[in-house]
Each structure stands twice: as C-alpha cells, then as structure tokens.
C-alpha cells in the first residue's frame, strides 16, 4: 500500500515522498521514482520562509512612505521585509502596515516612557511636587521649585500644570525672627 | 556527548505488553525525528516505527502495526515504544535511532539518515 | 513496501582488496538510501547517506555511489576493522526498509 506519511522535509504527492524545498525556493517539479524536486531561487523582490512546495514565492512587503513607513530590515530571498515608522510616529499594528504620530502628553500630564517605531507615548499624571505647563511627546513632569534653596518663599503654590511662584521674604519677618 | 539509551526490555509472555523508554541527552531532543529499529537474534536490521519532532506524525511497519504505538514527551528528553499483544517473533533488540537531515546547499535535496543508535535493549517474548 | 536486496549475502576477503557491494530497490528511490556497518553486539554505525554523501568521521576508502534502484557502496582497501555486516536502508518512503545485509569475513 502507499504511503500516507513522510518525514518533515518531504512531502507527498503520487504516493511518492518528495523533499521540500529549501527557505528562498520554489516549486518548479515534483520530484519522480528517479528524479528529485526541482526548485527554483525567489526573485529579487521575493522571498520564502520555510521548507515548502510552494509554487510561487511570496512578494517582500513595501514600506508605503505614503503611510508613513520606511525599510528597517531589507528582505532577503528567506524573510520578509520588515518595516517601521518615520521619526515620530508608530505603528499601528504588530504587523506595521501604517503609522500614527506619537500622542503628546496634555499639560498636567508628563512622559513616562517616550514612543518608539512600535508603541505610543506613555503618559502619567504628574504628582504632588511636580508639574507640566507643556503639550509635548518628550517632556517628564518636573518638580516644583525649590523656594527654600534660593532662600526664598512660596508666593503661589504650584499645581500639577504649573510651578510654584517664589518671592523674596518679608525683611520685616525676617529680623523679627531672628530677635 | 550525544547518547541515546534505552531500558525497559525484559522477557515477558505472548499476549503480554512491555514499554520501552529511550532517554536522550547531549543534543536538543525536541528537534529531531526518532525511530524505533529492531534485531532478531542472529537475523537483519527491521525498521519498527517513526515519530516526527513534535510528535504528531508517527508510522509503523505492517508486522506491528495496531498493537505498537510509539510517543515521545520532549520536555523529558524521553522516546517511547509500548508493545501491546506481544508475540515469539517480536523477540528483538530493540534499539531507538535518531533521524537526522543532511543538507548541503550546493547539493540536490537533502538527505536522510539515522546517524545516532542506542546500545538496544533485549526483549524476549516467550512462555 | 520498497524491497531492498543486498548482494551478495555474505563475502570473504583480504586486508588491502577493494570490495563492492550492491543494493537493489524494487522500485526508484532516487538518492533515499544510506548504508550502515554493523559488528557483533553493536549497534549500527551510519557510513553513508544520500546514496554517495560520507558520514563525517568515517574513512574515505569508503564511498557510495548509485540513484534510482542500483546503488553500491565500495570499500577501496579493507582494512582489518571493516570486517562487519552492511546494510543499506532506503528512506524514500514509510515503511522505510533495509537490505538483509552483508556479511564481510576474512579470508
């Protein structure tokens, strides 16, 4: 009785087991009681992945720029071409097929974790002791002013959008203080 | 060192089962297809059974078929025969073997072989 | 199944002769068969595959030669440790299947 199975690297067709071929080929003929596979580099633009018995290879991805995309790792005749975004955008997905521009982060609001080709901008909340007064994509929430170290006071105390505001120490106060 | 090393063999009763296990060590077990090959005292080498890498494609020849079943556990690094319905005429060396791919890119296809043996291990079905 | 049938079945000869042994397939196999060396209480040692290609390690007085359904495996000048059995093995299709061997003796 023929053959139902084969091993990994064959394939079977007319009861014959025929090798595969390599990643970077095709198909062109199966292989014969005498004749083995016949395969056929990928073009210059193709590629194939795997042992195969594909008969046509698969075209390298484009990295539209119109999208926004640009080449980061050329195909070769056994991988894709694998794309990513222009400065300041990233992709919208795993598979990169088109690009968003990085979110800014409000003010209120400062950069946890800057955006790269792959993943967005990561924004937090900007604590106690700290602010924001900008919209940007790179900027951290930065802490208040340090009235004390200028020796000076806090004339308007500072929000999560805003920095305090120092003024100079009443002198009046200030030698009553020290008497 | 690349070893294959099986154990389980034993005498045992027609009609009766045994499980043989093929440890192996040195090469990265889950990568490769195994096989199972046989020798009857004083007689040739017979081809038992097959299982693919992942353990998903097995094959066996026709004098065991239906009562042999072969299976692997990867994360073990471990191969398995169990023998069921055992018969005088399975009494073997029993060795596992694996198989390996040759590949030369300047050459036509590929090639296979079973380039690592065990040192076997006897079973003996009789009564 | 493909039928493998080794000739001849058992040979005697001398250190230093050159010996050739056949193996026939019952059907084409292309370039699917390798060939073992095999001596008592041993398990088989892989010498050739591919029909022609050597396994590393092993002496090139040996080599394979063949495709199709007539291969041969040639020993260039025996050396006292060839003295075993040889298999050849097809791995074309399942069943995968072996000649009934070769026994190499002294003379």
């Known amino acids: 009785e023929p053959p139902t199975a084969c091993r990994e690297k064959q394939y079977l067709i007319n009861s014959q087991c025929c090798s595969l071929c390599q990643p970077g080929q095709k198909l062109v003929s199966d292989c014969t009681e005498f004749t083995e596979t016949e395969c056929l580099p990928c073009g210059e633009s193709e590629f194939l992945d795997t042992w195969n018995r594909e008969t046509h290879c698969h075209q390298h991805k484009y990295c539209d720029p119109n999208l926004g995309l640009r080449v980061q790792q050329k195909g070769t005749s056994e991988t894709d071409t694998i794309c990513t975004c222009e400065e300041g955008w990233h992709c919208t997905s795993e598979a990169c097929e088109s690009c968003v521009l990085h979110r800014s982060c409000s003010p209120g609001f400062g950069v946890k974790q800057i955006a790269t080709g792959v993943s967005d901008t990561i924004c937090e909340p900007c604590p106690v002791g700290f602010f924001s007064n900008v919209s940007s994509a790179f900027e951290k929430c930065h802490p208040w002013t340090s009235c004390e170290t200028k020796d000076l006071v806090v004339q308007q105390a500072g929000t999560n959008k805003t920095d305090v505001v120092c003024g100079p120490q009443d002198r009046l106060r200030h030698h009553h203080h020290h008497h | 060192e690349v070893q294959l090393l099986e154990s389980g063999g034993g005498l045992v009763r027609p009609g009766g089962s045994l499980r043989l296990s093929c440890a192996a060590s040195g090469f990265t077990f889950g990568s490769y297809e195994m096989n199972w090959v046989r020798q009857a005292p004083g007689k040739g080498l017979e081809w038992v059974s097959y299982?693919?890498?992942?353990?998903?494609?097995?094959d066996y020849a026709d004098s065991v078929k239906g009562r042999f079943t072969v299976s692997r556990d990867n994360s073990k690094n471990l191969l398995y025969l169990q023998m069921n319905s055992l018969r005088a005429e399975d009494t073997a060396v029993y060795y596992c073997a694996r198989d390996v791919f040759f590949f030369d890119s300047s050459g036509p296809r590929g090639a296979y072989g079973m380039d690592v043996w065990g040192q076997g291990t006897m079973v003996t079905v009789s009564s | 199944d493909i039928q493998l049938t080794q000739s001849p079945s058992s040979l005697t000869a001398s250190v230093g002769d050159r010996v050739t042994i056949t193996c026939r397939s019952s059907?084409?196999?292309?370039?699917?068969l390798a060939w073992y060396q095999q001596k008592p209480g041993k398990p088989p040692k892989l010498l050739i595959y591919g029909a022609s290609s050597l396994e590393g390690g092993v002496p090139s007085r040996f080599s394979g030669s063949g495709s199709g359904t007539d291969f041969t495996l040639t020993i260039s000048s025996l050396q006292p440790e060839d003295f075993a059995t040889y298999y050849c093995q097809q791995l074309n299709s399942f069943p995968s299947t072996f000649g009934q061997g070769t026994k190499l003796e002294i003379k």
């Open positions: 299982i693919s890498s992942s353990g998903e494609t097995t």
């Open positions: 059907q084409g196999i292309r370039s699917s």
